[in-house]
């Protein structure tokens, strides 16, 4: 497992730009994996999008979101993942250790646990950005 | 357009509990990511945390994710924000927000006033 070199924690205005770019990246994701016919998702794997240990804007947890697409990638090897693990190591900002993910073997239930952690990450993007862009807004109907 | 109407707000002790919810009407409810937003006296408005239109959950904080329990009930149309534990520092006026896929919320209530103290 590698780790990643210290930066400096970014400005909202710049995790909002990634994070944009994320959930565009993740809904390309999703649509390509939904084309899989008669996979369910399943309630077995849950993606954890917010870090326990950090604050916004600089909470979204990049180390194991990204560990998960990886290991997407290595049964499914998408090529908008590469793109994703990219700008998720922007959003990672102190040395991390790896997530371990445990794999399903079975190959109906990897292409479950695909589409699930697709599905939630894509969500994960979309609620983070609503986060992020609905704090300067007036609570107002 | 969506139309959204806190309830469930009011005066409770340290360590007591509530349940807001947030009814909407106007539109096709199970669609949209749903989400609450709090604001205390002098301070930003802070995200407390949203919901999937799948039931798909993110917190803005392990506190709140240890405290606060984000559901909803798309047959009711009605979103929900179950609050344990309460402190003072939970004092604020809390609304509930909607919003479609890839856009910010754009629909928003009037707030409901929780005040925690003895």
């Known amino acids: 497992s590698h780790t990643l070199p210290v930066r400096l924690l970014r400005p909202s205005d710049d995790v909002q730009k990634i994070v944009e770019e994320l959930q565009s990246l993740s809904k390309m994701l999703l649509k390509d994996v939904e084309e899989e016919k008669g996979v369910l998702v399943s309630q077995n794997y849950t993606l954890p999008c917010l870090s326990p240990d950090a604050q916004p804007p600089n909470n979204i947890h990049s180390p194991a979101i990204r560990a998960y697409l990886k290991t997407i990638r290595q049964l499914d090897n998408k090529s908008v993942i590469d793109e994703i693990i990219e700008h998720l190591d922007k959003l990672i900002f102190q040395d991390a250790p790896e997530t371990n993910i445990s794999v399903p073997t079975d190959t109906h239930e990897c292409k479950r646990f695909i589409l699930t952690i697709s599905q939630q990450f894509s969500e994960c993007m979309d609620l983070a950005l609503k986060s992020l862009t609905s704090g300067a807004q007036q609570a107002t109907t | 357009e969506v139309q959204l109407v806190e309830s469930g707000g009011g005066l409770v002790q340290p360590g007591g509990s509530l349940r807001l919810s947030c009814a909407a009407s106007?539109?096709?409810?199970?669609?949209?990511?749903m989400g609450w937003f709090r604001q205390a006296p002098g301070k930003e408005r802070e995200y407390v945390g949203g919901?999937?239109?799948?039931?798909?959950?993110?917190y803005n904080s392990e506190s709140m994710k240890g405290r606060f329990t984000i559901s909803r009930d798309n047959a009711k149309n009605t979103l929900y924000l179950q609050m344990n534990s309460l402190r003072a520092e939970d004092t604020a006026v809390y609304y509930c927000?909607?919003?479609?896929?890839?856009?910010?919320?754009?629909?928003w209530g009037q707030g409901t006033q929780v005040t925690v103290s003895s």
């Open positions: 927000a909607a919003g479609t896929i890839g856009r910010p919320y754009d629909y």
């Open positions: 919901i999937s239109s799948s039931g798909y959950v993110m």
């Open positions: 106007g539109g096709t409810f199970s669609s949209y990511t």
